[in-house]
């Protein structure tokens, strides 16, 4: 999906009002400097591409993020404020339902959400170019 035409300010507002709190809640108990920042993004569409990938694509050691509160709110924000996003996700959602697993917060998931916090932080930068 090409995130170029999203309403970035509306997505930013959704992040600031709710998603950020849900990320904080998920990370509760984690040490501030436990994880290095290794994932980056250069502009807002790129940030959303990386955010979507880390939030919804299962990775080795962390298959359970998509059902977390922050993930569901992220999905809703993208569906509302990114034209055509919902349609591109129908197949992905059906595939995800087939491999749904019990929610387990692993250290790998915490590391992944730490990277997500960094990506959202970059997405929210006021001077970050959109293209």
């Amino acid at each position: 999906y090409d995130f170029t035409n999203c309403d970035f300010e509306k997505i930013k507002a959704a992040y600031l009002s709710t998603i950020s709190k849900d990320l904080i809640t998920y990370m509760s108990g984690t040490k501030s400097t436990e994880f290095n920042n290794t994932v980056s993004c250069s502009n807002r569409p790129h940030c959303l591409t990386e955010i979507q990938s880390l939030t919804f694509n299962p990775t080795a050691g962390c298959a359970s993020l998509a059902k977390e509160m922050f993930a569901m709110k992220t999905k809703a924000a993208l569906a509302i404020w990114c034209p055509g996003y919902s349609e591109t996700q129908i197949n992905a959602t059906q595939a995800m339902k087939k491999r749904r697993k019990r929610k387990v917060t692993t250290n790998k998931c915490l590391e992944q959400v730490s990277q997500l916090q960094g990506l959202w932080r970059r997405f929210n930068r006021p001077l970050l170019k959109q293209q």
Epitope: K21, S28, K31, S32, N37, S40, S114, R122, R125
Partner: antibody, heavy 118, light 107 residues
């Protein structure tokens, strides 16, 4: 182990600028955010701003925006905080402090006293 | 900005006493609260993060609790080295803010 070593005390005239340095060691400099926090005599701690050394992006407390500039010298693993248009109320101890993506401060510099007096 | 209000501002106590310091946030900060101890001429030292987690090396007599808008720091049995100023800080949202401090003095 992580260490943050700051430059020495400064005395400045009102209207002048001051630049405080913070040399980091014991970790990969680009991995974490560097913050500056100040404490005026008898006052609460006040967060001033932060810099991401990986790309030098800064965020500032609006109370200081326009007067504070935070920079880094990657080659020296050093962060700087410059405060301009100094006034007597800027007399304070200035600290650098380190965080990851979660913004509480588990590592602090020793502090730099800046005195603004005519 | 979220305001953090500590009480009391001053507290006199004796060695062996149990003391509690309170911090109230002006809006919900989940559990994103840290507590610091500061002695004269020194940088603050992290005691508690995530409202209730003790930082490495912090004695077990220090404990934190709370969520939402009300938080407490408790020292179960005061030791001579505990007389200092204590600050709470919220890191739930930008800009990060501190309480005004509680100065703990020997009675």
């Amino acid at each position: 182990q992580v260490q943050l070593v700051q430059s020495g005390a400064e005395v400045k005239k009102p209207g002048a600028s001051v630049k405080v340095s913070c040399k980091a060691s014991g970790y990969t400099f680009t991995s974490y955010l560097m913050h500056w926090v100040r404490q005026a005599p008898g006052q609460r701690l006040e967060w001033m701003g932060e810099i991401d050394p990986s790309d030098s992006y800064t965020d500032y407390n609006q109370n200081f925006r326009g007067r504070v500039t935070i920079t880094v010298d990657m080659s020296a693993s050093t962060a700087y905080m410059e405060l301009s248009s100094l006034r007597s109320e800027d007399t304070a101890v200035y600290y650098c402090a380190l965080t990851g993506t979660i913004n509480y401060f588990d590592y602090w510099g020793q502090g730099t006293l800046v005195t603004v007096s005519s | 900005d979220i305001q953090m209000t500590q009480s009391p501002s001053f507290l006199s106590a004796s060695v062996g006493d149990r003391v509690t310091i309170t911090c109230k946030a002006s809006q919900d900060v989940v559990t994103a609260v840290a507590w610091y101890q500061q002695k004269p001429g020194k940088a603050p030292k992290l005691l508690i993060y995530w409202a209730s987690m003790r930082h490495t090396g912090v004695p077990s007599r220090f404990s934190g609790s709370g969520s939402g808008t009300e938080f407490t720091l408790t020292i179960s049995s005061l030791q001579p080295e505990d007389f200092a100023t204590y600050y709470c800080q919220q890191y739930s949202s930008f800009t990060f803010t501190f309480g005004q401090g509680t100065k703990l003095e020997i009675k």
